[in-house]
């Protein structure tokens, strides 16, 4: 029997917002799991030098290296990084061993390196060794997973040629339409590329590494569904694989499926047939149509014709480069307050897209939806009624798509008042954008009536935090209201409001606010 | 190669103590826990608590706290543990085993067979 | 104390079937380790951490599991294989053993 290791070394990841984290470099709380670095015995070194197996860290992530030394008493110990000496607090845990902490946080280049750890016990000294790198994720791809044939079986591989390596699983369904989002029970997911049970409604296989995950759905004509009302459209670039399923349920086994293209039978090769019974014991039958490297001609319908079931067609358009098709001008939207309301987004793309809703230098995440017609929706509805401009945007591997929304509040004007030793001014952002009224108030107009023209500036601004419009108005000083109550009013469909100001010397007013509905 | 040895098969009265002796090779005895763990005939497996050699750190089960006492000696890489007030339901085989920093017992000795019988 | 509760207590199978025994912890803990046990032998470490192989043990035994529920399984069993296996933990201040599964031949 091998010895264990007599130290422990591990890495405890600590996610983004673990507010566990500590700034000292004795024992943070750990809630993630740690992973064994596997601390071996340093071959051809002089004395007990231990390394650890090498760490790799995104830019910004925090991490915890930690030695466990099973020798309980006094331990001293000290950190050496860059030829500098770093704090070390030991201490011990529940089990008497001895526990050695180092926290990096939010991971940068200069804390990359090799950080070396001495440990004294009363038994023996240790030299632990830890090398520390930012991973290189300029290197990693995910793709879109595609299908083939499996050699010699009736079978389909999924492929995703990503870097790292990606965690490959089919995603199926036997229902329909909603009932088969991600997480309905209806859903099945199966960890393996390959796939034997082909007969399933809803076949997608998915990918998903360090970037995210992308899924293919195998497109499916299904001969006992009313076709839709619009034909189903198909992109594809050139040299991609081509896959479309035709099933059909029949009574008995008395059918049989062809595909034809452009009313042209396919070639041998170019298809393959299975079928099976289902519970009730009807037989099912599926064709594959496949090619492995699409080319321009392979553009067209392809039909899928039963001897007992109508035929129903698919447009294949195999395309150069991708696309994103949508009408990219600016929208504008006034609603009420407690409108409900949404964005959205109607588009055509291939590949998919990946996209992003922004308002006031913020992302929110961005779901997709397909139509029966071919075409995508993307929607939002997550504005909370703040008035602003609302930016889409889309991309995929050889298109990008921007288009802008405003969105506008109807509600009465808030008026809110300044005065300086020169001048009054009133703004207000109700919207529709209100027109301006000055009033003075004198002996001859108790009930301030009596309108001021003179001296009188307005203007629209935007304000840049929301990208919303704010209105203000300004009266100049003349030495025929100084020392009078002036009240500017900021009126529009939905109302009135008007703030009444002493116009005496500068420094602070009093303000008195009237609400006019 | 790392071997504990332990002492061998002792037949006890209800009320006495038994001494049970460990003494390990092919390793740095103050490097390691050594553990107690016994067995009754047929039943599982129940720890006992454990010491550090060299050192007067001690750790006993809740269970024996009063009537087990471990020792060691350093001179001749040995652990004891002694259990008092015998009663028959002490009747099992008794391990001392080394414990590493991944906190399992990866060597045992061959076990002693207690029998407490009137 | 963490207690650990075996299941089945006893497995009987025949050799080159599939065994799968389990391991459940009263509340949540860290790592799970295995041992085996023969009649008359002292308890062999199988698996530590919860998943890492033991020095010479052979890779039809593996082992997974988190949190409170824990798995051994031994993909094809081989005549030598058939013994006692226990679980344990050392989460807490003192560690505690499963009761065991007896693998017996069927």
């Known amino acids: 029997n091998q010895d264990l290791p007599v130290i422990k070394c591990v890495l405890i990841n600590h996610k983004n917002n673990d507010s566990s984290v500590g700034k000292s470099s004795s024992y943070p709380m750990v809630s993630e799991s740690p992973e064994d670095l596997g601390c071996a015995l340093r071959p051809q070194s002089s004395g007990t030098v231990y390394e650890a197996a090498a760490v790799e860290v995104d830019v910004s992530a925090s991490i915890t290296l930690q030695v466990l030394v099973d020798a309980p008493g006094n331990i001293s110990c000290l950190w050496v990084f860059k030829h500098s000496s770093l704090n070390c607090q030991p201490h011990f845990d529940l089990q008497n061993r001895g526990v050695v902490s180092m926290v990096i946080l939010k991971m940068t280049e200069t804390q990359a390196g090799e950080y070396l750890l001495f440990i004294q016990s009363e038994a023996t000294n240790y030299t632990i060794l830890f090398t520390v790198s930012i991973r290189n994720t300029l290197l990693y791809t995910l793709r879109r997973p595609y299908f083939r044939k499996m050699e010699n079986q009736d079978a389909l591989v999924c492929i995703s040629e990503s870097v790292p390596e990606p965690i490959v699983e089919w995603v199926l369904c036997d229902s329909q339409g909603e009932s088969c989002k991600e997480e309905s029970p209806a859903v099945v997911k199966k960890e393996e590329k390959v796939l034997h049970e082909l007969f399933g409604t809803d076949i997608r296989c998915c990918a998903r590494n360090e970037l995210g995950r992308e899924c293919t759905r195998l497109f499916t004509i299904d001969l006992n569904q009313t076709p839709q009302t619009t034909l189903p459209q198909l992109f594809l670039k050139v040299g991609e694989p081509l896959w479309i399923r035709c099933k059909a349920v029949h009574v008995n086994h008395g059918f049989g499926l062809t595909w034809e293209l452009e009313n042209k039978a396919l070639e041998e090769g170019n298809y393959f047939e299975m079928s099976t019974y289902s519970t009730n014991r009807t037989m099912i039958r599926i064709l594959f149509a496949f090619v492995s490297s699409v080319a321009r001609n392979d553009t067209g319908y392809y039909t899928c014709s039963s001897s007992k079931h109508p035929s129903q067609s698919a447009l294949v358009t195999i395309v150069e480069k991708g696309f994103i098709n949508a009408t990219n001008s600016s929208e504008d939207y006034e609603i009420d307050q407690y409108e409900e309301f949404c964005f959205s987004v109607r588009f055509k793309a291939y590949p998919q897209i990946r996209c992003t809703w922004t308002f006031s230098r913020k992302s929110f995440p961005c779901e997709q939806k397909g139509l029966d017609n071919g075409y995508s929706i993307s929607k939002f509805c997550n504005h909370k009624h703040q008035p602003g401009e609302y930016i889409f945007h889309a991309e995929n591997d050889d298109a990008q798509f921007t288009k802008m929304f405003t969105l506008n509040i109807r509600r009465k004007p808030q008026v809110l008042a300044e005065a300086s030793a020169s001048q009054a001014s009133c703004f207000s952002d109700g919207y529709p954008l209100p027109s301006w009224t000055w009033k003075k108030c004198s002996d001859k107009s108790p009930n301030c009536t009596e309108e001021i023209t003179e001296g009188v500036w307005n203007r629209k601004a935007n304000r840049k935090v929301f990208g919303q419009w704010v209105s203000s108005s300004t009266l100049n000083m003349s030495e025929a209201i100084k020392g009078f109550l002036v009240k500017c009013c900021a009126y529009n469909s939905l109302g009135t409001s008007c703030e009444t100001i002493l116009l005496n010397s500068p420094g602070p007013f009093p303000f008195i606010q009237d609400n006019i509905s | 190669q790392v071997q504990l040895v332990q002492s061998g098969a002792e037949v006890k009265k209800p009320g006495a103590s038994v001494k049970v002796s460990c003494k390990v090779s092919?390793?740095?005895?103050?490097?390691?826990?050594i553990n107690w763990v016994r067995q009754a005939p047929g039943k599982g497996l129940e720890w006992m608590g454990n010491?550090?050699?060299?050192?007067?750190?001690?750790n006993y089960n809740e269970n024996f706290k009063n009537r087990v006492t471990m020792t060691e000696d350093t001179s001749t890489d040995t652990a004891y543990m002694e259990l008092s007030s015998l009663r028959s339901e002490d009747t099992a085989v008794y391990y001392c085993?080394?414990?590493?920093?991944?906190?399992?017992?990866?060597?045992w000795g061959q076990g002693t067979l207690v029998t407490v019988s009137s | 104390e963490i207690v650990l509760t075996q299941s089945p207590a006893t497995l009987s199978l025949s050799p080159g079937e599939r065994a799968t025994l389990s391991c459940s912890a009263s509340s949540s803990v860290s790592y799970i380790h295995w041992y085996q046990q023969k009649p008359g032998q002292a308890p062999r470490l199988l698996i530590y951490?919860?998943?890492k192989l033991a020095s010479g043990i052979p890779a039809r035994f593996s082992g997974s599991g988190s949190g409170t529920d824990f798995t051994l399984t031994i993909s094809s069993l081989e005549p030598e294989d058939f013994a006692v296996y226990y679980c344990?933990?050392?989460?807490?201040?003192?560690?505690?053993f499963g009761g065991g599964t007896k693998v017996e031949i069927k």
């Open positions: 092919g390793y740095t005895f103050p490097y390691y826990w």
């Open positions: 085993a080394r414990r590493n920093v991944y906190l399992t017992f990866d060597y």
């Open positions: 010491i550090y050699p060299g050192s007067s750190i001690i």
């Open positions: 951490d919860t998943s």
């Open positions: 344990q933990q050392w989460t807490s201040k003192s560690p505690t």
